[in-house]
């Protein structure tokens, strides 16, 4: 997260880190005791999932292995549409005040809605500085029409943009797959943006979760 702030401790109990060994690979969101939602481009052979702590590499955090993941069947490595994936945990999480599932959206929030994005991604770009604490940034949803002025045809129909005019605050390397939460519901998953990160008026681009609720529910049901 560029130009963000340290999240209030325990305020993101659904936030997870997808680790490769002990190294941050992507963010993710707990949606069920067995399931984490993340970006399709975060796919690996297997994952170590850290839950229940704002500190990356926290020894007291829950760590659960995940060996199965299900990309959206329409994910394209060319256009990056449908950049969404479900990761099935090998064992269920122990829910607590520190570990909770996020609320999936009932509807798509409109442009102008205030949201918070979080992650352990680099706080500087292009040179990287990875924080140990979970970082947050407050952003607003931007209309597709406005966002297309920047990204033109790169912006797919199920992509969502968020940012703050003239501000550098944005997501960056390592934040991928992490949550954009608006009015206590998951509205976006970090997908992409311009690079170096934090260029003013280049919004962050997210997978618009409200368009995928049916796929999420059906996939979890199928692979119970």
């Amino acid at each position: 997260i560029i130009d963000g702030y340290k999240c209030k401790e325990g305020s993101h109990p659904w936030q997870v880190a997808l680790l490769k060994g002990n190294q941050l690979h992507c963010g993710g969101v707990l949606v069920d005791k067995y399931w984490v939602l993340t970006a399709a481009h975060c796919k690996m052979g297997q994952y170590q999932v850290q839950l229940g702590s704002d500190k990356i590499g926290d020894q007291s955090a829950q760590k659960i292995k995940a060996t199965k993941s299900f990309r959206h069947p329409g994910y394209s490595t060319k256009t990056h549409v449908n950049d969404i994936m479900l990761v099935r945990l090998d064992e269920p999480v122990k829910m607590s005040s520190k570990v909770e599932a996020v609320q999936l959206p009932e509807h798509c929030e409109p442009p102008g809605t205030s949201c918070t994005v979080s992650g352990w991604g680099t706080t500087t770009s292009p040179d990287v500085t990875f924080p140990s604490d979970l970082m947050c940034s407050d952003v607003k949803l931007i209309s597709s029409r406005e966002c297309k002025k920047v990204y033109k045809d790169l912006l797919g129909k199920t992509m969502l943009c968020a940012g703050i005019p003239d501000s550098k605050t944005n997501t960056c390397n390592g934040d991928s797959g992490g949550p954009l939460v608006c009015n206590d519901t998951l509205q976006g998953l970090v997908s992409w943006g311009t690079y170096p990160c934090g260029q003013p008026n280049d919004p962050g681009v997210y997978t618009q979760v409200c368009k995928y609720k049916r796929w999420v529910m059906e996939t979890m049901k199928t692979h119970r």
Partner: antibody
Framework: QVQLVQSGAEVKKPGASVKVSCKAS????????IHWVRQAPGQGLEWMGS????????NYAQKLQGRVTMTTDTSTSTAYMELRSLRSDDTAVYYC???????????????WGQGTMVTVSS | DIQMTQSPSSLSASVGDRVTITCRAS??????LNWYQQKPGKAPKLLIY???SLQSGVPSRFSGSGSGTDFTLTISSLQPEDFATYYC??????????FGGGTKVEIK
């Protein structure tokens, strides 16, 4: 030191295969994509394809589809490019390059290997 | 696929000259164009990304401009070490990534 180091020059007969390696150091290999670009003697640059070091996702140039395979070994931070059924017009310097970006998209090549000369001759 | 056309294919110039190279895309690529310098026997080196942003460590005599389909690389005062071949590429509609044919800058 952030670098990509490629394997040495190769001489191959038409119809043979070649496998070029590209070892990354000084950065997190799985965080960026590796692309392969070739340059025939006295010619311009030609994009061959790319691979995501973490997911293994590949995209290949249409003209090379079926003849090229790109792989990675994350345990050694090494990318490989294999080209089969070699022809004389595959004679070129082959470069690996790191694509800079974040998330699903990359925007430019900010780091290149030193190149590997592959000569195809009977 | 988007085609990238560079002009001129070669030019002769003297030290101190202002040199301009152009790159034209077959369709709009917004500002997702990059410029590279390549010297004989060496790998290309990034000069400019995003049409106009100077890569770290690249001298300020290099500048880029343009958006949409027409782009320019300018060397404000040519130095002896600038004699090389220059390439543009586009990362807008990818894959494939497409390169311009190159512009060779030679000593007059």
């Amino acid at each position: 030191q952030v670098q990509l180091v490629q394997s040495g020059a190769e001489v191959k007969k038409p119809g043979a295969s070649v496998k070029v390696s590209c070892k990354a150091s000084g950065y997190t290999f799985t965080s960026e994509g590796i692309h392969w670009v070739r340059q025939a003697p006295g010619q311009g640059l030609e994009w061959m394809g790319s691979i995501s070091a973490s997911s293994g996702d590949t995209n290949y140039a249409q003209k090379l589809q079926g003849r090229v395979t790109m792989t990675t070994d994350t345990s050694t931070s090494t990318a490989y490019m294999e080209l089969r059924s070699l022809r004389s017009d595959d004679t070129a310097v082959y470069y690996c390059a790191r694509a800079a970006g974040y998330g699903a998209r990359s925007w430019y090549f900010d780091l290149w290997g030193q190149g590997t000369m592959v000569t195809v001759s009977s | 696929d988007i085609q990238m056309t560079q002009s001129p294919s070669s030019l002769s110039a003297s030290v101190g000259d202002r040199v301009t190279i152009t790159c034209r895309a077959s369709q709009s690529i917004s500002s997702y164009l990059n410029w590279y310098q390549q010297k004989p026997g060496k790998a290309p080196k990034l000069l400019i990304y995003g049409a106009s942003s100077l890569q770290s460590g690249v001298p300020s005599r290099f500048s880029g401009s343009g958006s949409g389909t027409d782009f320019t690389l300018t060397i404000s005062s040519l130095q002896p070490e600038d004699f090389a071949t220059y390439y543009c590429d586009q990362f807008y509609s990818t894959p494939p990534i497409t390169f311009g044919g190159g512009t060779k800058v030679e000593i007059k």
